[in-house]
Amino acid sequence: APVRSLNCTLRDSQQKSLVMSGPYELKALHLQGQDMEQQVVFSMSFVQGEESNDKIPVALGLKEKNLYLSCVLKDDKPTLQLESVDPKNYPKKKMEKRFVFNKIEINNKLEFESAQFPNWYISTSQAENMPVFLGGTKGGQDITDFTMQFVSS
């Protein structure tokens, strides 16, 4: 069977939504009303990996696009990017590790930890209109907590 994928949107803990910023970057900003239609819809795939009640391995693709969030080393630093893939081969149950995030939910907080780089998380800045990035600190200035809204296909 193919991998099960469900559509969802994400907001950070300050209620900023995620939108496209150019072809290969996401940014976080506050949206209201009809502007909410700009927010990115992810296709979240439940992939192979170590799993527990609080931790589920997922891949985050952009709905109806052959783009996936991935984690790679750039200048020796773990970095978040949008990577183009062959739509004939993705998504799949055994995703390469750079595409895999541990979706961790504890006490109303939802985090996305890179499977490739443990303790590095999908992050947003406090400031408006800044890129979504991979951050190596929790509980600091940068935001690593999200809420998820599943949406019908």
């Epitope: 099960r4 469900l6 969802c8 009640n53 609080d54 907080k109 999200f146 019908s152």
Partner: antibody
């Protein structure tokens, strides 16, 4: 023994609001995703709201999106459904059920509470 | 979304009979299928998940099979307590939807 006990059902006028509660016992509530499923009189089942075990994930089908809000208080083992702008077609028995998006099925159900929307 | 169609909508059978209910999905649901039993005036009860896995405490006379879009629920030997309405439900893609139900009566 797992127990889910719903309350809050009532007769309300169209356009009004109602809040349902579900008290859970017999399992570790904070470890389970929860849902509300409704059944109109003499009809089938419809899933109307979902919340993840910690409360950070939610889902609503288009029929109730923007009108219903699901929430939970894990410290009190209680699930809620806030229903606003009620319509006659929302008339149903509302069941609290254990399960949701990830597991996909509902393995424990409450006895239901009746909501009637009528002028 | 994916629609679930159950057949028949109602049926009568005798104690000891083998009873079969079918559920057809409007698209492939890859065995992400559940069956529930709802006895009159009661809440639904989970019987089968993942198309063929029996839920805890469910008698072995109940079984499920099928693949792709077509699934079958079987009671090998009907008992009086099986009088109920049976529902299928898929959980492949959102929204997860239920079939319209099959009402089972004893002749």
């Amino acid at each position: 023994e797992v127990q889910l006990v719903e309350s809050g059902g009532d007769v309300v006028q169209p356009g009004r609001s109602l809040r349902l509660s579900c008290s859970a016992s017999g399992f570790i509530f904070s470890k389970y995703d929860m849902s509300w499923v409704r059944q109109a009189p003499g009809k089938g089942l419809e899933w109307v709201a979902y919340i993840s075990h910690g409360g950070a994930g939610t889902y609503y089908p288009d029929t109730v999106k923007g009108r219903f809000t699901i929430s939970r208080d894990n410290s009190k083992n209680t699930l809620f459904l806030q229903m606003d702008s009620l319509r006659p077609e929302d008339t149903a028995v509302y069941y609290c059920a254990r399960g949701g998006v990830y597991k996909g099925y509902f393995d424990e159900w409450g006895q239901g509470t009746l909501v009637t929307v009528s002028s | 979304g994916i629609q679930m169609t159950q057949s028949p909508s109602s049926l009568s059978a005798s104690v000891g009979d083998r009873v079969t209910i079918t559920c057809r999905a409007s698209g492939n649901i890859y065995d992400y299928l559940t069956w529930y039993q709802q006895t009159p005036g009661k809440a639904p009860k989970l019987l089968i998940y993942n198309a063929k896995t029996l839920a805890e405490g469910v008698p072995s006379r109940f079984s499920g099979s099928g693949s792709g879009t077509d699934y079958t629920f079987t009671i090998s030997s009907l008992q009086p307590e099986d009088i109920a309405t049976y529902y299928c439900q898929h959980f492949w893609t959102l929204p997860y939807t239920f079939g319209q139900g099959t009402k089972l009566q004893i002749t």
